[in-house]
């Protein structure tokens, strides 16, 4: 009966990881956190990357690592497949570098099973990576900064700070 106790799953209490296709997890997670609150605090550090919209699979991937899927049927947490990790890394690592940070060693894709099979269970992730991202994602570099108002041509989108800033000269009133 001890094993039955071990297998019990807990509801996911992290809001950004709710409604992602599964709703229970088991700690510790795949990066060693014992508590969901600790996992949640780490997850908040990825918000700029999620809002940037580098990969449609990023949020699901992160949740599958920090609150892996649990099932009463097997005693091990089910995390992401290596393929999803590589897909997310390929699209998001360049953006991470723009923020001045390296791809986390804790998300090293070689840690995850290459694919879901009877030997190693893992989650492949939702949908096709090539599907265009929803329009609600933030402005991408090169897009115009219409949100700042009438003088939008005086602004440029800066990746690192995730906002629109005045082009050189305008703040000094040279072109106004």
């Amino acid at each position: 009966f001890g094993d039955e106790e071990e297998r019990r799953c807990d509801p996911i209490r992290i809001s950004m990881c709710q409604n992602l296709g599964y709703n229970v997890t088991k700690m510790p997670n795949l990066v060693g956190h014992e508590l969901q609150t600790d996992a949640e605090l780490q997850l908040t550090t990825f918000t700029p990357l999620i809002q940037y919209g580098c990969s449609s699979q990023l949020q699901f991937f992160l949740c599958s690592v920090y609150v892996p899927m649990c099932t009463e049927k097997i005693n091990i947490p089910i995390g992401p497949c290596g393929g999803m990790c590589l897909s997310v890394k390929r699209r998001c690592e360049p953006v991470l570098k723009e923020f001045g940070f390296a791809w986390p060693e804790s998300l090293n894709c070689s840690k995850f099973p290459p694919q879901n099979d009877h030997n190693h269970m893992c989650m492949e992730g939702p949908g096709d990576e090539e599907v265009p991202l929803p329009h609600k994602t933030p402005i991408q570099p090169g897009e115009e900064c219409h949100s700042v108002g009438t003088n939008s041509d005086q602004y440029i989108w800066v990746k690192r700070s995730l906002n629109c800033v005045l082009k050189c000269g305008y703040d000094a009133g040279l072109y106004s």
Epitope: S15, V31, G32, H33, E34, L35, T37, D38, E40, L41, Q42, T44, T45, F46, T47, P48, L49, Q51, L96, F99, F101, A102, P104, E105, S106, L107, P138, S161, L162, N163
Partner: antibody
């Protein structure tokens, strides 16, 4: 340029209250978790509290739980720390800091700090 | 709570010296360890994150190593501007905790 400017510090009697503010600029405020870290005179750093970008999740050190409340107004790009039931041991310089790290919580930008003195 | 113990608490060194500061966690924290530099009257500055990654803009003479419970910050060749207090910080679990600091003084 990322800037964090704290205000609201001062002298307060034990048992009193104070509200600290931190005005943020130069980055998309809603994208980042924020934190308060304090430093008693001549002592080391002590983490006080943190809040997620949306404000939906908050975290506290045991020493301030139930007395301090962290909050943020994303429309004003401002972080707050409401401090109640203040004690002498709360005397410190309070720094607001941006929390980032992409999988490890680091404080990459800090304000200049505001001094809170609790004394009768 | 995870306790972070730094050693030494202070040290004297000369310009050009190789300086090593250690930080020990009371339990395993994997690589969730960051290093900061603080000068008198100033806010701390991030140097190293995730045990060994150099923060953007920080000189390469600073390096970090370690995993689990034992970590090291090394300054390969001490410069005049490096005289300061150095803190380690764990971000493995809340409450986030800092080491007591190591003051690097001029010999």
């Amino acid at each position: 340029e990322v800037q964090l400017v704290e205000s609201g510090g001062g002298l307060v009697q034990p048992g009193g209250s104070l509200r600290l503010s931190c005005a943020a600029s130069g980055f998309t405020f809603t994208s980042y978790a924020m934190s308060w870290v304090r430093q008693a005179p001549g002592k080391g750093l002590e983490w006080v509290s943190a809040i997620s970008g949306s404000g939906g999740s908050t975290y506290y050190a045991e020493s301030v739980k139930g007395r301090f409340t962290i909050s943020r107004d994303n429309s004003k790009n401002t972080l707050y720390l409401q401090m109640n039931s203040l004690r002498a041991e709360d005397t410190a310089v309070y720094y607001c800091a941006r929390a980032t790290g992409f999988g490890t919580v680091v404080f990459d930008y800090w304000g200049q700090g505001t001094l809170v003195t609790v004394s009768s | 709570d995870i306790q972070m113990t730094q050693s030494p608490s202070s040290l004297s060194a000369s310009v050009g010296d190789r300086v090593t500061i250690t930080c020990r966690a009371s339990q395993s924290i994997s690589s969730y360890l960051n290093w900061y530099q603080q000068k008198p009257g100033k806010a701390p500055k991030l140097l190293i994150y995730a045990a060994s990654s150099l923060q953007s803009g920080v000189p390469s003479r600073f390096s970090g190593s370690g995993s689990g419970t034992d970590f090291t910050l090394t300054i390969s060749s001490l410069q005049p501007e490096d005289f300061a207090t150095y803190y380690c910080q764990q971000s493995y679990s809340t409450p986030l905790t800092f080491g007591g600091g190591t003051k690097v003084e001029i010999k």
